[in-house]
Amino acid sequence: RKIPKVGHTFFQKPESCPPVPGGSMKLDIGIINENQRVSMSRNIESRSTSPWNYTVTWDPNRYPSEVVQAQCRNLGCINAQGKEDISMNSVPIQQETLVVRRKHQGCSVSFQLEKVLVTVGCTCVTPVIHHVQ
């Protein structure tokens, strides 16, 4: 699902307030509901009909620094007999999300929002077959 554009209107101050020079603003990176956790079912990535592996990407200049990415293990999907079914495809499920990017310019540090694509898992689909006209 596409994230709505974070337009300038989102960050605009109320009309009664003076404008901030250079378009800068304060950003509190404390997290609301920080203790809220999404718990995955045990080994769901291995029990899925389109199993996947996880890779942790690390970037010290990104917040959060750690982003987990999934990669589909198979081209096809796993059937009830545990065999790869090549009439179907395992495809990644991707979600756009925003992270904060830290940028160094000499001694000054600035922060910018960056859109990243996170693969959260895989699903099984019927592939598209193109017929030559």
Epitope: Q71, L75, S90, P92, Q94
Partner: nanobody
Framework: EVQLVESGGGLVQPGGSLRLSCAAS????????VGWIRQAPGKQRELVAT???????NYADSAKGRFTISRDNAKNTVYLQMSSLKPEDTAVYYC?????????????????WGQGTQVTVSS
């Protein structure tokens, strides 16, 4: 969407070689996992070889030691080098790829099949 076009098939004598190509085209896409699948007349489709986006390969027992799958990411093309061909390798060879596509709706992933290329091994 992504179009896959296979080429390189033909008639070859037993013991001969062929190199199949699978070229992917489209607007804004990245090819992930790709496989070569074959179907002989009156038989079920068989997975011959696969290659991941990172270059890891996997082969069916019937292809091990004789076939080599490779990819050229810059050309969005995957190859299947077939050597020591046998009459039982006669089949239509299809390319199947999973690709991530970006269009006006956003980014999504899907599976795509080509039309296939005929390989006939006969003396």
């Amino acid at each position: 969407e992504v179009q896959l076009v296979e080429s390189g098939g033909g008639l070859v004598q037993p013991g001969g070689s062929l190199r199949l190509s699978c070229a992917a085209s489209g607007r804004d896409f990245r090819v992930k996992n790709v496989g070569w699948i074959r179907q002989a007349p009156g038989k079920q489709r068989e997975l011959v070889a696969t290659i991941t986006v990172g270059g890891s390969t996997n082969y069916a027992d019937s292809a091990k030691g004789r076939f080599t799958i490779s990819r050229d990411n810059a050309k969005n093309t995957v190859y299947l080098q077939m050597s020591s061909l046998k009459p039982e390798d006669t089949a239509v060879y299809y390319c199947n790829a999973v690709a991530t596509v970006t269009d006006y709706t956003g980014t999504y992933s899907d599976g795509f099949w080509g039309q296939g290329t005929q390989v006939t091994v006969s003396s």
